[in-house]
């Protein structure tokens, strides 16, 4: 359940264009009245048309100093930073000849795959048709063409071998024109998945469409096999246009149900028929009960690192395995097993972190909780107990981008103690003193406080992508000096388009309540006057390890509600949210639906005390986990909320996916946590909806949070004879995309305006 990512960057985002000054973000006041008169408020149409969307530039690195980029006219262009030269390697004409929407250059630069007929499946997965174009002769490779549709395809890291998944089996080509070698034969729809994840692994564990990994020089190919034979199936109708609806069947393990059985295999791609795929052994302490595979990291061509997780997700084991030439097998000695255990919650943050290996090919850097309960970078040489802590403080390291011989690049929220910021740091690891430098903190301090980065080979160059709070900008930098080389994308058109728009004001501040820090973002109408009273809308996500209060740019629905409709919108990060230490994060462990709701209510009470909120006009809305929290808040019996909206809410944790739910809730069994599973449903609170206006919304083809969740809420409300409003979106999934998006936001706008007695 990762809707919060979508909510942060999609149409339903919460941040707006802002310049953060002393934590309050204010637009410069206009001097001339004539200029003020030309300003207009945002319209709902602006939002639905994506008028104020922004662009980012992530180079497709192909060496230390070269990258590919698709130009505005769809040519694929190779840029050389050192020479300053660029040339088109693939014309838009060639792209158009097969209606290609994506491409991939082989590492030997001889071939390009072109991807067309994109057909979305789940969050990351899709099928497509692939064509191979030979750059040396300017022709498509004929003979032994690839089958269609393919579920996943990738080049080897060296040369131009191809691995692909077709009908749940893995195939290998030594050269694009060669006949394929079939690696697996047991693949079967909805039963056995080779090289691609099943639904739950894709959504809740790997967060990728693939489950195969080439070794660094392409000698070996590792892959996962998922056996879903015993998993219960979720079935729902897809109405389509035919006389009879189709039934969609997905093996989907809900909390406590039978899980997929995973095995990892490695095959020598040079002589694939010699010994065939060899299974990698599972650590004994993991194999003794239900378990998950969580990630695979190649260290060298003959050393691989696997991470495993117990079904009760507080114990993770990292296992380093070596190839034994004499036996042609993979050996995972116990001495190379590293255990990571949480005594206060689950292992890791949202996922267990992955290792970044150093040049000795055995020691590595990894983010995990320190003794004070903050996630920090540690260096592991022999045992986890002897880990050397690299970063420390009452803040968190978020991501390790790259480790070179002498530097480690990472992101954190250390700077100025704002958890919702991200800056990039460089730590020297081969010199004294062990200097730490913030690469981004002072670059564009007001405009840019939330960065990510993308590094070329050996970190010779890197791109910085700033997401806000000002207009996003992407820049290219020298990896040795950190000097800015050029601007890759600065969103000039967006900047010009916003010049006559009355954007809301935005502030990020914190509330201190009973030893808990509640960070909030408040979006205020353009002519905000503290002496007046405004309707308040709370936007909530609140899921474990999420973060809503972030210093990022967005012009979206809530920006419009503040700008045009004069609402105050607030987002609050309460207990269970991320990047502020384990105490806050793990507070919700085994008790979902309690503290997240309490903290939203506490914040609303504090907002009322500020004096500018009309306490008779307060609403709450959320999507996915946020729909669950908004529903529980509305049914809290506090009388604070006049109305609220739940989009695609979870209504009972027994209905949601095992991997996600059990991580935070344990099992729904009598001897584990069944009692809280039962106590935390929305249905159990049906009676409490009597005094609020409730709008319940769901897509009927939601593969993630099944329509079942809203069906059960509706049934409970009807049985309790409680009036409510509802909207379903036929054949729409968890994202409610396309025309449904327009309908959804128009419908929710009407609902809120009616609730707040605002004229249409």
């Amino acid at each position: 359940m990762k809707t919060w990512v979508k909510i942060v960057f999609g149409v339903a985002t919460s941040a707006v264009l802002a310049l953060l000054v002393m934590c309050i973000v204010l637009r410069p006041s206009r001097v001339h009245n004539s200029e003020e008169n030309t300003m207009r408020a945002l319209t709902l149409k602006d939002i639905l048309n994506g008028t104020f969307s922004y662009k980012t530039f992530f180079p497709n690195w192909i060496s230390g100093q070269e990258y590919l980029h698709q130009s505005a006219d769809n040519n694929i262009v190779l840029y050389n930073i050192e020479t300053g030269q660029s040339y088109t390697i693939l014309s838009n004409r060639t792209m158009k000849s097969v209606n290609a929407s994506n491409y991939g250059l082989s590492p030997d630069r001889q071939f390009v795959y072109l991807e067309s007929d994109y057909s979305k499946l789940w969050r990351y997965s899709y099928t497509a048709t692939y064509y191979i174009y030979d750059l040396s002769n300017g022709e498509f490779v004929r003979g032994n063409e690839l089958p269609r549709p393919i579920q996943y395809l990738c080049w080897s890291p060296v040369g131009s071998k191809l691995a692909y998944v077709y009908q749940n089996n893995i195939y290998l080509k030594q050269r694009p024109g060669d006949p394929p070698f079939q690696i697996t034969f047991n693949g079967r729809e909805n039963k056995i998945f080779n090289g691609i994840p099943d639904w739950v692994y894709e959504e809740e564990m790997l967060a990728t469409k693939y489950a195969l990994w080439w070794s660094p020089n392409g000698k070996f190919l590792a892959y996962a096999e998922f056996n879903d034979t015993d998993i219960p199936v979720i079935a729902y109708s897809y109405y389509g246009d035919e006389q009879y609806p189709r039934t969609i069947n997905i093996p989907y393990p809900k909390a406590g149900a039978k899980n997929p059985v995973v095995r990892i295999f490695i095959i020598d791609t040079t002589y694939p028929a010699y010994v065939g795929p060899q299974e990698v052994p599972v650590p004994a302490m993991i194999a003794s009960s239900d378990y998950y595979f969580s990630w695979l990291t190649w260290v060298t061509d003959e050393r691989v690192c696997l991470q495993w997780l117990k079904r009760v997700q507080n114990v993770s084991v990292l296992s380093i395995c070596d190839f034994r030439e004499d036996w042609q097998t993979w050996d995972c000695p116990k001495t190379q097993e590293h255990i990571e255990e949480s005594r206060t919650g689950w292992a890791g943050g949202f996922f267990v972190s992955t290792p970044v290996f150093s040049y000795d090919a055995i020691s590595y850097y990894k983010i995990f909780s320190d003794k004070d309960g903050y996630k920090h970078i540690h260096y592991i040489k022999d045992t986890v107990e002897n880990a050397i802590q690299i970063t420390s403080g009452k803040w968190e390291a978020i991501n390790i981008f790259r480790v070179t011989q002498d530097s480690l690049f990472y992101s954190s929220n250390e700077f100025e103690e704002y958890p919702g910021r991200r800056n990039i740091y460089r730590i020297s690891i081969g010199s004294y003193p062990p200097s730490k430098k913030c690469v981004t903190c002072h670059l564009r301090k007001e405009r840019c406080q939330y960065y990510t980065a993308s590094f070329s080979d050996y970190a010779k160059y890197y791109a910085l992508v700033c997401y806000g709070p000002g207009i996003p900008i992407s820049t290219l930098h020298d990896g040795r000096t950190d000097q800015e080389i050029k601007i890759l994308e600065e969103n000039k058109e967006l900047e010009n388009a916003l010049k006559n728009i009355q954007l809301p004001k935005e502030e990020i501040k914190k509330l201190e309540v009973d030893e808990i820090t509640l960070w909030y973002k408040m979006i205020l109408p353009p002519q905000f006057d503290r002496s007046k009273k405004y309707p308040l809308l709370i936007q909530v996500y609140g899921g474990p390890c999420s973060q809503s209060v972030r210093s990022v740019f967005a012009v979206n629905w809530i920006s419009y509600l503040a700008s045009k409709e004069g609402m105050v919108i607030a987002l609050v990060d309460g207990r269970g949210t991320a990047f502020q230490g384990d105490k806050l994060l793990y507070a919700v462990y085994r008790k979902l639906g309690v503290y997240e709701v309490e903290d939203q209510i506490t914040a609303v009470r504090k907002f009322i005390e500020m004096g500018f909120i009309d306490e008779k006009r307060i609403a709450i809305w959320g999507w996915s986990y946020g729909g669950y929290v908004s529903s529980l808040a509305l049914a809290s019996g506090t009388g604070l909320f006049k109305c609220g909206i739940a989009v695609a809410p979870v209504s009972s944790w027994e209905y949601y996916a095992s991997v996600y739910t059990e991580r935070f809730m344990g099992l729904p069994t009598k001897d584990d946590n069944l009692e809280h599973y039962k106590n935390s449903t929305v249905m159990a609170r049906a009676e409490y909806f009597r005094n609020v206006d409730y709008l319940l919304i769901h897509g009927t083809a939601d593969d993630n949070v099944h329509f079942q969740n809203s069906a059960q809420i509706a049934k409970a409300l009807v049985n309790a004879q409680v009036d409510f409003q509802a909207m379903w979106y036929s054949d729409q999934n968890h994202g409610l995309s396309g025309l449904s998006t327009n309908h959804l936001y128009t419908h929710m706008t009407h609902f809120l305006k009616q609730c707040f007695s605002l004229s249409d």
């Epitope: 690299i390 004294y432 062990p434």
Partner: nanobody, 118 residues
Framework: EVQLVESGGGLVQPGGSLRLSCAAS????????MGWFRQAPGKGRELVAA????????YYPDSVEGRFTISRDNAKRMVYLQMNSLRAEDTAVYYC???????????WGQGTQVTVSS
């Protein structure tokens, strides 16, 4: 938390040698950047040796390079400073220090006096 206790200081003649020891308790000392500092009367604290836990690389200022050697024994949780060819200007209180990678030295011993005099 790390507790550090120095020993081995004393009076020594110019050209002589001395070996300082630092016993670490609490968190394991090999997890930390370790160093020896000194402070002469009326002067600021200066680093004389440091040892990197990542690769056991050692660092010395020019003033002691070739004369002082820092080493560690992880099993015994000890850090040593071997001082040879001592000079009068080496007279100071010597402190053992430990620290996290990114926050430098935040744990300190009480210090041990070294006097070089004839």
């Amino acid at each position: 938390e790390v507790q550090l206790v120095e020993s081995g200081g004393g009076l020594v003649q110019p050209g002589g040698s001395l070996r300082l020891s630092c016993a670490a308790s609490g968190s394991t000392s090999n997890n930390y950047f370790m160093g020896w500092f000194r402070q002469a009367p009326g002067k600021g604290r200066e680093l004389v040796a440091a040892i990197n836990p990542l690769d056991s690389n050692t660092y010395y200022p020019d003033s002691v390079e070739g004369r002082f050697t820092i080493s560690r024994d992880n099993a015994k949780r000890m850090v040593y400073l071997q001082m040879n060819s001592l000079r009068a200007e080496d007279t100071a209180v010597y402190y053992c220090a430990a620290g996290h990678w990114d926050s430098h030295f935040n744990y300190w011993g009480q210090g041990t006096q070294v006097t070089v005099s004839s």
